[in-house]
Interface confidence: medium
């Protein structure tokens, strides 16, 4: 029950996260005009990954798309790529995880297959979340660098007077949406990986155990799972696994391989 809940929650959290990553990628407010000491301006400028916009004091807003690949800063291209990779991985992860959900029965799909699919989708969500966080962070770093470079000469005082900070571009709403969404996708992915570990708990419980129960013939294979049973409570969950099924130790080792993605 806890495994199903963890898996389901991981799926929902990842779904929300990926929807957020898509929203952030499409949003225009990645960088906005910093109005800290320029609160009254006739035109408010802001930019996204795909277009640049301006809002006039009358409320009229117009945007123009970036009709090029070559003419844009390399960093912007890199951020676009990271966000798109994140969305694609996340979308594939969602598709895989739908079939992996324990609460959804698809034909005679075995628990081992569902465990594998859960792990795969979990890893995809983790990488997707990291891509989104990386993309947003690269863009934020670019803004911070530009902000401080532009204001580097703010202390060139004349007659002892210190100049005020210049108006620059600062973090837009899309950055915060992206960070939160990336984080949610990452958390969802971790939950899916945790759920994967609990999908087949019997694996270690019966490892290398062999005994006879009077009146019943029950066989347990070392390194494998219960092959058959006459016990009523278990019959509805009867699954057959081959002796080469992945051990819990192997399952455990998977997430650690992706710690440094």
């Amino acid at each position: 029950m806890a495994v199903t809940a963890c898996q389901g929650l991981g799926f929902v959290v990842s779904l929300i996260g990926i929807a957020g990553i898509i929203a952030a990628t499409c949003m225009d407010q990645w960088s906005t005009q910093d109005l800290y000491n320029n609160p009254v301006t006739a035109v408010f400028n802001y930019q996204g990954l795909w277009r640049s916009c301006v809002r006039e004091s009358s409320g009229f807003t117009e945007c123009r798309g970036y009709f090029t690949l070559l003419g844009l800063p390399a960093m912007l291209q890199a951020v676009r790529a990271l966000m798109i990779v994140g969305i694609v991985l996340g979308a594939i992860g969602l598709l895989v995880s739908i079939f992996a959900l324990k609460c959804i029965r698809i034909g005679s799909m075995e628990d081992s297959a569902k465990a594998n699919m859960t792990l795969t989708s979990g890893i995809m969500f983790i990488v997707s979340g990291l891509c989104a966080i990386a993309g947003v962070s690269v863009f934020a770093n670019m803004l911070v660098t530009n902000f401080w470079m532009s204001t580097a000469n703010m202390y060139t005082g004349m007659g002892g007077m210190v100049q005020t900070v210049q108006t620059r571009y600062t973090f837009g709403a899309a950055l915060f949406v992206g960070w939160v969404a990336g984080g949610l996708t990452l958390i969802g992915g971790v939950m899916m990986c945790i759920a994967c570990r609990g999908l087949a708990p019997e694996e270690t419980n019966y490892k290398a155990v062999s005994y006879h129960a009077s009146g019943h013939s029950v066989a347990y294979k070392p390194g494998g799972f219960k092959a058959s049973t006459g016990f009523g409570s278990n019959t509805k969950n009867k699954k057959i696994y081959d002796g080469g099924a992945r051990t819990e130790d192997e399952v455990q080792s998977y997430p650690s391989k992706h710690d440094y993605v």
Epitope: N38, T41, S52, E56, R64, G65, F67, T68, T151, T167
Partner: antibody, heavy 120, light 106 residues
């Protein structure tokens, strides 16, 4: 390298119209706006408007609405400005200049200018 | 519209002298750009986004300011710096230019 090549000088009669061109090369024409700037002899600079070839959108200085019409031909990477109902006030050097992909960016490359003389 | 007032209109400086010209905006703006124009040529982008030097501009030039007050400074005047300098804002429609500061060499 980025270049903006403007058409040659024009001598026109009052009331007539003139169309001057600005051929862009060395960059993606559809990615940056083309601004038009007027400079009367011995005087300062005056912004007429911009056209964004990417989607054909335009923005005019109210003062030049009805006087100037901005167009762009993507296939030839050329921007045009047509001035109508010319008077002596319109005698000036007209520059085309490339803006940035951000609205408030400076104009980084300028054409050599086209001299328009309105005289009967 | 935002009116940009440049001062002084004309100034002269000796080689090696420090030069400062100002541009005052009638309303607060986000960036100021500066262009250099020599007689018979088209303007050149000189300083953009208030303080960034365009490529090829000597390091003796600098720009600063915020809100409504901006300035262009030459730390050590040279003969080739003699030109007219225009400030320009693109923060509000219509975009406007200052009247220009004509810098002459003594």
């Amino acid at each position: 390298q980025v270049q903006l090549q403007q058409s040659g000088p024009e001598l026109v009669k009052p009331g007539a119209l003139v169309k001057i061109s600005c051929k862009a090369s060395g960059y993606t024409f559809t990615s940056y706006d083309i601004n038009w700037v007027k400079q009367r002899p011995g005087q300062g600079l005056e912004w007429i408007g911009w056209i964004y070839p990417g989607d054909g959108s335009t923005k005019y200085n109210e003062k030049f609405k009805g006087k100037a019409t901005l167009t762009a031909d993507k296939s030839s990477s050329t921007a045009y400005m047509q001035l109508s109902s010319l008077t002596s006030e319109n005698s000036a050097v007209y520059f085309c200049a490339r803006g940035g992909y951000r609205y408030d960016e400076a104009m980084d490359y300028w054409g050599q200018g086209t001299t328009v003389t309105v005289s009967s | 519209q935002i009116v940009l007032t440049q001062s002084p209109a004309i100034m002269s400086a000796s080689p090696g002298e420090k030069v400062t010209m100002t541009c005052s905006a009638s309303s607060s703006i986000s960036y100021m750009h500066w262009y250099q124009q020599k007689p018979g040529t088209s303007p050149k982008r000189w300083i953009y986004d208030t303080s960034k030097l365009a490529s090829g501009v000597p390091a003796r030039f600098s720009g600063s300011g915020s809100g409504t007050s901006y300035s262009l400074t030459i730390s050590s005047m040279e003969a080739e710096d003699a030109a007219t300098y225009y400030c320009h804002q693109r923060s509000s429609y219509p975009y406007t230019f200052g009247g220009g500061t004509k810098l002459e060499i003594k």
